[in-house]
């Protein structure tokens, strides 16, 4: 008896991180024997959508003409052949940016830093959030994020880097997000250029501890009341 049908491949074009209002196409590729393709979205009634295969029957297209909050989430696809349904594909996480206003990203004490010294990148959001993501352009592992362990919402998160080396130099942006859906991100912050001077080299730089700060009282939009180390935010490299 033949083993289970091989799982299909699931991907999104132009990518899996889509700005609000932009179009995205989800592709599911199975085998030439496929008769039907099904796309399931986590926490949605299954199936989320069904499509007939496109010739030569080894893939199907699921179109999202205008990205909104409702489409953000985790997807899997299956195909049906004469012998039954396939295994599920690996999940595709479709993320929407533009769900909230852009945070602001600062470098303290300055974006000009000497190799071997310390710098902290500070990401601040307009409304309280529980996840902050730091992105470095053209990095092999660009995503670093701080997430509140207790659902405590913060207006800002700090990403300290020490000691700084030339590898830390580059262009950074940050995003913020709410715990109720990590598939919904803010607009990206304006870019911040971190310039490292000096010649100390360290091939494996890593940020140190994280710090989050609650916002001040209502009449002071972003004058924090004080820094609390860690404060419920947990660091993840992704």
């Amino acid at each position: 008896q033949a083993g289970p049908l091989p799982k299909p491949t699931l991907w999104a074009e132009p990518g899996s991180v889509i700005s609000w209002g932009n179009s995205v196409t989800i592709w599911c590729q199975g085998t030439l024997e496929a008769r039907e393709y099904r796309l399931d979205k986590e926490e949605s009634p299954a199936p989320w959508d069904r499509q007939n295969p496109l010739e030569p029957k080894n893939k199907a297209r699921f179109s999202i003409p205008s990205m909104t909050e409702d489409y953000a989430g985790r997807y899997r696809c299956y195909y049906r052949s004469p012998v039954g349904w396939s295994q599920p594909s690996d999940p595709l996480e479709l993320v929407m940016t533009g769900a909230y206003s852009k945070p602001t990203l600062s470098a303290l004490p300055s974006p000009l830093v000497t190799s071997g010294k310390s710098v902290t990148l500070l990401c601040q959001s307009r409304s309280p959030m529980d996840t902050f993501l730091l992105i470095k352009e053209r990095a092999a592992h660009p995503l670093l994020h701080l997430r509140s362990e207790h659902g405590a919402q913060q207006h800002q998160a700090e990403f300290p880097m020490s000691p700084v080396t030339s590898v830390h130099g580059g262009t950074y942006r940050c995003f913020s997000s709410h715990g109720f859906s990590h598939y919904l991100l803010s607009h990206p912050s304006d870019p911040l250029e971190l310039i490292v001077s000096g010649s100390l080299e360290d091939p494996r730089p890593s940020p140190t501890r994280s710090v989050s700060t609650a916002a001040g009282p209502e009449d002071q939009p972003l004058m924090p009341t004080g820094s609390v180390p860690h404060s419920g935010l947990r660091r993840h490299w992704e």
């Epitope: 209002g21 769900a99 909230y100 602001t104 009449d219």
Partner: antibody, heavy 117, light 113 residues
């Protein structure tokens, strides 16, 4: 394209109330604060308050507290501001504006409210 | 409340010349948390809504011509138009967003000489 489209001009008598609407489109409505700003004829800009559509949270300038009420209808992506106990000095253009980070990156076209007996 | 005071109230500048508008706040707008100044500049043409030009005192909004520049820190800020164009005739406002209530300057009317 982000757009904030406001309701038309209103003429009201002193003591009456007026309700101005601001319909948002072209962005994720729930995640952005909407503020209201007053501009009397030939004068400057005065901040009235904000509403956060996601939660309905509001905050008002003390000067307008008790007379201004902001509400939201998420099903139509519309924010409303009601101003009660109108007096002649409430004659102004009222703008809704989308907050970026406490500053305003998009504005409605304005609604003229005239208070006259 | 933070009081924002602009000077001059009105200004007439020849086409192609530099226009300078000043804005003074009654307390510092420089945040110790991020070393940013919580100040924005807007342009309002007759019969139109205001338009954001500058935020964080010196960051130009997308689509704003580079002849507009913001500078200053603490309590003293400047909006400079390096080479005045006919379409720059408008009233210009500064706004502080350091603390509530948000407040604006009284406006500076810019005209062609």
């Amino acid at each position: 394209e982000v757009q904030l489209v406001q309701s038309g001009a209103e003429v009201k008598k002193p003591g009456a109330s007026v309700k101005v609407s601001c319909k948002a489109s072209g962005y994720s409505f729930s995640g952005f604060y909407i503020d209201w700003v007053k501009q009397p004829p030939g004068k400057g800009l005065e901040w009235i308050g904000y509403i956060f559509p996601s939660s309905g949270e509001t905050s008002y300038n003390q000067k307008f507290k008790g007379r201004a009420t902001m509400t939201v209808d998420k099903s139509t992506s519309t924010v409303y501001m009601e101003l009660s106990s109108l007096r002649s000095e409430d004659t102004a253009v009222y703008y809704c504006a989308r907050q970026a980070f406490y500053y305003f990156d998009y504005w409605g076209q304005g609604t003229t409210v005239t208070v006259s007996s | 409340d933070i009081v924002m005071t602009q000077s001059p109230d009105s200004l007439a500048v020849s086409l192609g010349e530099r226009a300078t508008i000043n804005c003074k706040s009654s307390q510092s707008l420089l945040s110790s948390s991020n070393q940013k100044n919580y100040l924005a500049w807007y342009q309002q043409k007759p019969g139109q809504a205001p338009r954001l030009l500058i935020y964080w005192a010196s960051t130009r909004e997308s689509g704003v011509p580079d002849r507009f520049a913001g500078s200053g820190s603490g309590t003293d800020f400047t909006l400079t138009i390096s080479s005045l164009q006919a379409e720059d005739v408008a009233v210009y406002y500064c706004q502080q967003y350091y603390s509530y209530p948000l407040t604006f300057g009284q406006g500076t009317k810019l005209e062609i000489k």
